[in-house]
């Protein structure tokens, strides 16, 4: 007997799709070897139609795929647009030739069934409404009208014109006539369920003069759409349930053992397992909505269903749409920290991966909010103004070509705790979710700036010092001036290598920044930070106020004001006359043309991308000593 297992018989109808799962023994060799699907010929030869090596036959072009799921020890063959020519004997198997391990599968594709001429076929989805049309002659205009359902030889009345309704059709079936029509009556059956399917007979009159019509009702269960997503990527379920449920509560549920467990609904219910990584967005007034889930996990794989009902819960006889989500563990999206911890007053540097093939894409960072159906207002972006409340403490540093950008948030408070999303206007799969946890600080911050009340006087020299601990000794220290389009690192150069020191004096590690002479436009936020290459670390921020020298006020000697800096043997100073053209930039409204859940933070449109790139020092000059 073959160790490969799968469906022995698969039957479908023309135009449909099939998804055939083949199971193989869980060994390393099996997980990595070639998987194939071939058609058995009369001569005993099995012709490959598709394989995991990338081969795809001409007859399967554009309509088939083979996907390996090594973590489940399965592979799936999807074939769409079936025709009767697809009927035949097949093998799914493993190995370098088609004679290896295999399982025989019989596929039968039938024509859409035909009925006698007098039978009208009605095809409806679960939860929908069917209107059965019943014609009669004038002689039966005043006779009793009825609709019955065939059960073997018997025909059980569903509804009739004497107002009888079968209990199982109560509140679902109505019999009516339209306008002045004297030769047709109609029966509506709403909230269709699978057991409603079958042959119906409508009748006007009694005995041999009665007019009869046959109706075959087919109630289709939702054909799940197959979705294949990578681990850590995102998925969007687009749900279109029709206008008739436009005003009912919507939900997305995941089929479980006993029930379909609601993940999110429009009444505010949300599964804690999806906290911080789910958004439900109404698309229009016709009942369309979408659910976006980011940071896909292995356990997210499964059967999902969206639906509508006033309770916000799945109900039999209400329209649904279905998906089967597969999560591929062999992901192109790198593993990044899902939880980042910080302390009050401190800072965090969050690394956001993006598709390295799209280095020119616009990068964004948004804050997931739990209210209503979840939303994610953009806080910062490469072409978006920093949102109110984040000025001077939030910046995005793009690192073109590295496949990642860094978002730095400092002056942390406990209110900053929550979920944040990294996203771009490019590949929508590359959306990562980070949970930021901010705890109360129990010790002094690693970086401290003096003086803490920084007021510079126009025309004078102003120096601020940043004290850092020995653990940052080998790291690159920098000062940058914060603006709405990033934090622009102030230029510096080392005048000779610093003397290496075996011991490190905790009190003498200082990096200073000097403004000489101070200009009005020097006012603003400055950051002191540490980094190693492209990896950003701790930062601290200080606001430098600039004022006119008042007549009669003493001229403060900057050397005295920064006496501590003067004595520092390990001092690194930067002197800069900084000119900042604050390019006001705005999030392109086309970015989420169909994803309004991620809100635009900008309020000033600008056609061109901001010219200053975070981390660049273009247009600035200065010296260090």
């Amino acid at each position: 007997q073959s160790p490969i297992f799968g469906p022995q018989d698969v039957s479908s109808i023309e135009g449909n799709s099939v998804s055939i799962t083949c199971y193989y023994p869980d060994t390393s060799v099996n997980r990595h070897t070639r998987k194939y699907w071939c058609r058995q010929g009369a001569n005993g030869y099995c012709a490959t139609l598709i394989s995991s090596n990338g081969y795809l036959s001409k007859e399967y072009s554009g309509r088939a795929s083979l996907i390996n799921f090594p973590e489940n020890s399965t592979f799936v063959i999807n074939i769409a647009h079936l025709t009767q020519e697809d009927t035949g004997s097949y093998k799914c198997g493993l190995g370098t030739t088609n004679r290896g391990l295999f399982f025989d599968v019989s596929l039968e594709v039938s024509q859409v069934p035909e009925f006698p001429n007098d039978t009208h076929v009605y095809t409806k989805d679960i939860g929908r409404t069917v209107t059965i049309e019943c014609r009669f002659k004038e002689g039966n205009a005043h006779s009793k009208k009825s609709l019955c359902k065939k059960r073997g030889e018997a025909c059980e009345v569903v509804i009739d014109s004497t107002e009888y309704v079968d209990p199982s059709y109560k509140d679902r079936a109505i019999l009516f006539m339209k306008g002045t029509s004297r030769d047709i009556f109609y029966v509506n059956i709403s909230h269709l369920i699978p057991s409603d399917a079958g042959l119906y007979v409508c009748q006007a009159g009694e005995g041999p003069s009665a007019d009869k019509n046959n109706a075959d009702l087919q109630v289709l269960e939702p054909e799940p759409e197959l979705l294949y997503k990578d681990l850590r990527s995102s998925v969007t379920f687009e749900c279109d349930l029709g206008r008739e449920v436009a005003n009912d509560a919507k939900y997305l549920c995941r089929k479980n053992k006993e029930t379909c467990d609601v993940i999110i609904n429009t009444l505010g219910k949300r599964d804690p397992a999806f906290e911080g990584r789910i958004l439900l967005t109404p698309r229009d007034d016709n009942g369309r909505f979408s659910v976006l889930i980011t940071g896909l996990r292995k356990e997210d794989a499964g059967h999902y269903q969206c639906g509508a009902h006033s309770s916000g819960l799945p109900q039999e006889g209400w329209p649904v749409q279905a998906w089967q989500l597969f999560v591929n563990e062999e992901s192109t999206i790198p593993n990044s920290r899902s939880v980042v911890k910080g302390v009050t007053g401190g800072s965090v540097a969050i690394v956001c991966p993006y598709n390295p093939k799209e280095s020119s894409s616009l990068k964004y960072w948004c804050h997931w909010e739990a209210d209503e159906n979840g939303r994610c207002p953009v806080l910062v972006g490469t072409q978006a103004l920093v949102q109110e409340g984040y000025e001077g403490r939030l910046a995005l540093f793009d690192q073109p070509g590295s496949g990642a950008y860094t978002v730095i948030l400092n002056q942390l408070t406990t209110q900053d705790s929550g979920f944040y999303w990294c996203l771009t206007d490019g590949d929508s799969r590359w959306r990562t979710t980070i949970e930021l946890q901010v705890a109360e600080a129990t010790k002094k911050p690693d970086l401290e700036v003096t003086p803490q009340n920084a007021t510079a006087v126009i025309g004078e020299t102003f120096t601020i010092s940043c004290h850092y601990p020995c653990k940052f000794y080998s790291q690159e220290k920098y000062w940058c001036k914060w603006s709405n389009d990033g934090c622009h690192i102030l230029p510096s150069h080392d005048e000779g290598a610093r003397q290496s020191s075996v011991s490190c004096d905790q009190s003498s590690q200082i990096v200073s920044m000097t403004l000489n002479p101070v200009k009005k436009e020097d006012e603003g936020w400055y950051w002191c930070g540490v980094k190693e290459g492209q990896v950003y670390g701790e930062t601290t921020a200080i606001y430098v106020a600039v004022e006119e020298r008042t007549r009669g006020s003493p001229h403060i000697n900057p050397t005295d004001a920064n006496a501590r800096a003067k004595d520092a043997p390990e001092e690194e100073a930067m002197e800069s006359s900084v000119r900042e053209d604050e390019n006001k930039a705005n999030l392109d409204p086309r970015l989420f043309a169909d994803e309004r859940e991620i809100q635009n933070a900008g309020d000033q449109a600008q056609e061109n991308r901001a010219s200053g790139n975070a981390g660049s020092a273009g247009g600035q000059s200065g010296s260090s000593k």
Partner: nanobody, 126 residues
Framework: QVQLVESGGGLVQAGDSLRLSCAAS????????MGWFRQGPGKEREFVAT??????????YYTDSVKGRFTISRDNAKNTVYLQMNSLKPEDTAVYYC?????????????????WGQGTQVTVSS
């Protein structure tokens, strides 16, 4: 909840046929697959056959020992699944259980089935 009721079991001679039925009621709209398992005297419960569906597409799975002899089918309108058993052998003697699943990753695994019937006895004498 889904309720399952089996019928059609009995005592037959080797080589004879039997047709088992499993009628489902309750929240049947949630089901995705239905199958048959059996438990012979002193043995563990084992997979026999399962039918899963997706719209108008059916997938039928069988254990090796019944291939070509047993056929599983379903009547959607009646919410009923059948197991047609031909060329019965004494080793087919067992209690046959009907099972239904809302989510099925591997149809052979017992723990993937959410609902079970009470079972119907099939005895094949030689």
């Amino acid at each position: 909840q889904v309720q399952l009721v089996e019928s059609g079991g009995g005592l037959v001679q080797a080589g004879d046929s039997l047709r088992l039925s499993c009628a489902a009621s309750g929240r049947t709209f949630t089901t995705y697959g239905m199958g048959w398992f059996r438990q012979g005297p002193g043995k563990e419960r084992e997979f026999v056959a399962t039918i899963t569906w997706s719209g108008s597409t059916n997938y039928k799975y069988y254990t090796d020992s019944v291939k070509g002899r047993f056929t599983i089918s379903r009547d959607n309108a009646k919410n009923t699944v059948y197991l047609q058993m031909n060329s019965l052998k004494p080793e087919d003697t067992a209690v046959y259980y009907c099972a239904a699943s809302t989510v099925l990753t591997d149809p052979r695994r017992l723990n993937e089935y959410d609902y079970w019937g009470q079972g119907t006895q099939v005895t094949v004498s030689s």
